[in-house]
């Protein structure tokens, strides 16, 4: 008799677990920026503080009738999803509500900013345990709202936002597009994207993961013991805020980067039917449904990585795309992808003290994406080694020459624009262990890292016959850090990582032209972290 | 994730002809004006003036006051609704859009964003 959404996100082994920190009281506090709420509801009574914060625009229309239960509906339901006694994800969590949405569910960017500042002030006046901020709202892209989220996140606050219900690219909305927030899309009981009338959940590279958001049973403001079902990315975000609150309740020192990586790593993979999303967004949208991860004590020092896509570069000749990792994460590899196949490769460079992944469009190309592999590598020391393009006919070799450094990724960037002239780069794991090998006109970049117990190996898989893509997966216990495509003479669209799978894409028109001897190879660099071991390259 | 997607950024580096004040004329606006790409969601008349990150507390207040003073010289009344100190330096103002050019030329201003609606999801 447990509601479907709780069954979905809380694995069986967690069902009986108490949402309490070791001292018996949950120190996590969730701030909800939403409508007013009915604090006297059985689900949330005694665990919700209704702050005096109120920054909302006037309701539209002269005949608008303010009915308390309707004004409180959205916020009460979300408060119940986060910490409700019976239908909540994190049942023991205390919640503070700030009113930034009016009785019609409308607010302003400025009101939201003042709300976020109120939280920061509260934090400064009375420092407490971990803070989670739930933003179940969305407006158009706002540089300042995203910046405010960034500033608050850098103080240690975890922000969770709704992806938006516009059946559109979440990157066009704020706070969903802020990289520092955990952005959540909505799925239904069948793990499919939520449709809401003619619209539905947002999608794209700005979504971190999905969570239940259709027909969610939760507190109804109609009465103190009433329940109702509501749908939307707000409900999905509330589930993730609850999961985060439970994670922090067990382990209060988890950082935003660790939380996000763990949410991604332990989510349910590949259950969403991606055909629901527009074709150009399918590769960018994560196929992940949130579940409550086990504690770090149960899972040990796993190497956790995620894939971060850049914005599209645009079609101009010298257009570049940039993908960035979070400040705490290490950029272990950089690849690129172009739907037309016209790209000049990718490389890693330092901008303002941070390594970033860059990709360059080619003449006649429709634009490129840079694809960064961002990982949590404790006590890592990473560097980039690059070699300029070799003279015609010569190979370029780059390897990790520092002691105890291992190769985690390779990037290749071509100086020439003529795609027909150049031969593609290659990775050779057998002949030259731990080397990136480039060919004519390619600059080669090797990402080399030293970390206690870090070991890596190359895994390749080639297909000779016609194929749109070639994949290679890292086996259990290993994590994909680098992904490249090593083609024969054909035009490749590029390579990218999907969870632990390296995907190499080949141009449609190139498939028929290829002879059986010119295999397209997906080359994965798989690493693992064994804290007791020495850094090593596995052949 | 933070690249400016479907977003309007307008350069309003307007020459200050109507006012011969030396400090004003000397400061060429490099700040930009931004607003929501969805017209129906815009709230013209309310603006978030975002100052450079290193701007000190006193400078925020001075900038807001300077804007009020200069607007008054032109016969405009502007209302400072809120001053942001803790998350970012800036202030929220209610004013005519006629004053945007003037506001963008103020020292310390990084950009100005027109207020807009957000919605429950």
């Amino acid at each position: 008799s447990i509601p479907w959404n709780l069954e979905r996100i809380i694995p069986a082994w967690h069902q009986t677990e108490e949402d309490r920190s070791p001292d018996g009281s949950s120190q996590v506090e969730v701030y909800l920026l939403d409508t007013s709420i009915q604090g006297a509801h059985r689900e949330i009574e005694g665990r919700v503080t209704i702050t005096d914060f109120n920054s909302v625009p006037e309701e539209d229309g002269t005949r608008f009738h303010r009915q308390a239960s309707k004004c409180d509906s959205h916020g009460t339901h979300l408060a119940g999803v986060v910490s409700g006694r019976d239908a909540g994800v994190a049942k023991g969590t205390s919640l503070h509500s700030l009113r930034v949405l009016n009785c019609q569910g409308k607010g302003t960017v400025s009101g939201t900013l003042i709300g976020l500042e109120f939280i920061r002030k509260s934090q400064l006046i009375q420092p407490s345990g971990p803070l989670v901020v739930l933003l179940p709202l969305a407006g158009g892209y706002s540089r300042i709202l995203n910046a405010a989220c960034r500033h608050l996140a850098r103080t240690g606050v975890v922000l969770v936002a709704a992806a938006g219900n516009f059946r559109d690219d979440a990157c066009l909305y704020s706070p969903a597009s802020a990289p520092e927030v955990i952005t959540v899309g909505a799925t239904n009981a069948q793990d499919q994207p939520v449709t809401l009338g003619t619209l539905g959940t947002n999608f794209g590279r700005c979504v971190d993961l999905f969570a239940p958001g259709k027909d969610i049973i939760g507190a109804s403001s109609d009465c103190s013991t009433c329940f109702m079902s509501q749908s939307g990315t707000s409900q999905a975000a509330a589930h993730v805020a609850g999961i985060v609150a439970r994670m922090l309740s067990r382990e209060p020192t988890l950082t935003l980067a660790e939380l996000r990586q763990r949410l991604i790593h332990f989510s349910t993979k590949d259950v969403i039917n991606m055909a629901w999303f527009p074709e150009d967004q399918q590769v960018l949208t994560p196929n992940l449904v949130a579940t409550l991860p086990p504690s770090t004590h149960e899972t040990g020092g796993q190497l956790l990585c995620r894939t971060v896509w850049s914005a599209h570069s645009g079609p101009t000749r010298t257009a570049t795309a940039t993908a960035r990792c979070a400040p705490e994460e290490e950029l272990l590899s950089c690849s690129s992808f172009s739907r037309s196949g016209r790209r000049r490769g990718d490389w890693i460079e330092a901008i303002g003290g941070q390594q970033v992944c860059k990709a360059l469009n080619a003449f006649g190309g429709e634009g490129v994406y840079a694809v960064a592999r961002c990982c949590l590598v404790p006590r890592a020391n990473c560097s980039i080694h690059n070699t300029p393009a070799a003279r015609a006919g010569l190979e370029t070799h780059v390897h990790c020459h520092q002691k105890d450094h291992v190769l985690t990724g390779c990037s290749f960037h071509w100086e020439v624009e003529d795609l027909s002239v150049r031969r593609q780069p290659a990775l050779r794991s057998r002949r030259q262990p731990g080397q990136c090998v480039g060919h004519q006109a390619a600059s080669v970049y090797a990402s080399c890292c030293h970390a206690p117990g870090l070991e890596c190996k190359i895994k390749e898989h080639g297909i000779s016959g016609p194929s749109e893509q070639v994949t290679v997966a890292c086996e259990a216990g290993w994590t994909l850090t680098g992904c490249n495509v090593l083609p024969g003479a054909s035009l490749t669209l590029g390579a990218y990582s999907v969870d632990n799978l390296c995907v190499a894409r080949v141009h449609d028109t190139a498939r028929a032209d290829r002879t059986s001897g010119e295999a397209t190879v997906a080359a994965a660099i798989c690493c693992r972290s064994r804290p007791s071991a020495k850094a090593s390259w596995v052949q | 994730q933070d690249e400016d997607g479907d977003y309007e950024e307008l350069m309003l580096a307007l020459p200050s002809q109507e006012d011969g004040l030396a400090d004003e004329a000397a400061h060429v606006a490099t700040a930009t004006f931004r607003r929501c790409s969805k017209e129906a969601w815009r709230l013209p008349g309310t603006y978030i003036v975002v100052l450079m990150e290193e701007t000190q507390r006193l400078q925020i207040e001075q900038t807001a006051h300077r804007l009020q003073t200069r607007a008054a010289r032109r016969g405009y009344v502007i209302k400072v609704l809120h001053i942001f100190y803790d998350l970012f330096p800036g202030f929220l103002v209610k004013m005519s859009s006629d004053l945007l050019g003037l506001a963008l030329k103020l020292p310390h201003v990084e950009y100005i964003e027109e207020d807009s609606f957000v919605f429950a999801q």
Epitope: S1, I2, P3, A40, S69, R85, D86, A87, K91, I217, D222, C223, S224, T225, C226, F227 | -
Partner: antibody, heavy 126, light 106 residues
């Protein structure tokens, strides 16, 4: 079918703590579909809800009695209990236990009280 | 708290007659109102919930109506076993009961 039975002392001295237990038979107390409630009725007067608990021990109380009430649950015995501290003559009443549908699982039925125990009279007197 | 006022306090009627009982709330309780029947020495029994829905096993002669602040319980034709005390109860804001209406034989 589900039955509830109240038990406990019929006489309590003023300023002491009233303690009652409700034993559930014909069904399990362990269900997300229900809360378990205490309701009282002073002689010749109306009914007053005291508070409710679910099988996980999550409680909520009548705000006017909250400071004096503790409700607990023992799932191993299929029982829940009421403690009312600092009693006075005004606490003299027939005390009923009842099942309350939680409303979380719509199939469980309407969110009201029923079935009830037959009630036990508690007199507060020295 | 929401106060429920029942009227009349006592209703004297004969079997076969129609009984109309009233319950007024101090503020809107929407449709979150129930009616219970209590016979001497017995626990209350749920008759009507959510203002107008009959509980399982309750005869069709019992009906409820109203919303907001004014509610009515109607017994279309009194049977001998219907003579009892009737309570209304709201759940809009926690739980409160009315003072009761006693339906007695005339």
């Amino acid at each position: 079918q589900l039955q509830l039975q109240e038990s406990g002392p019929g006489l309590v001295k003023p300023s002491e703590t009233l303690s009652l237990t409700c034993t559930v038979s014909g069904g399990s107390i362990v269900s997300s579909s229900y809360y378990w409630a205490w309701i009282r009725q002073p002689p010749g007067k109306g009914l007053e809800w005291i508070g409710s608990i679910n099988y996980k021990g999550s409680t909520y109380y009548n705000p006017s009695l909250k400071s004096r009430v503790t409700i607990s649950v023992d799932t191993s015995k299929n029982q829940f209990s009421l403690k009312l501290s600092s009693v006075t003559a005004a606490d003299t009443a027939v005390y009923y236990c009842a099942r309350e549908n939680s409303g979380v699982v719509p199939a469980a039925g309407p969110n009201w009280f029923g079935p009830w125990g037959q009630g036990t009279l508690v007199t507060v007197s020295s | 708290e929401i106060v429920l006022t029942q009227s009349p306090a006592t209703l004297s009627l004969s079997p076969g007659e129609r009984a109309t009982l009233s319950c007024r709330a101090s503020q809107s309780v929407s449709s979150y109102l129930a009616w219970y029947q209590q016979k001497p020495g017995q626990a209350p029994r749920l008759l009507i919930y959510d203002a107008s829905n009959r509980a399982t096993g309750i005869p069709a002669r019992f009906s409820g109506s109203g919303s907001g602040t004014d509610f009515t319980l109607t017994i279309s034709s009194l049977e001998p076993e219907d003579f009892a005390v009737y309570y209304c109860q709201q759940r809009r804001n926690w739980f409160t009961f009315g003072g009761g209406t006693k339906v007695e034989i005339k």
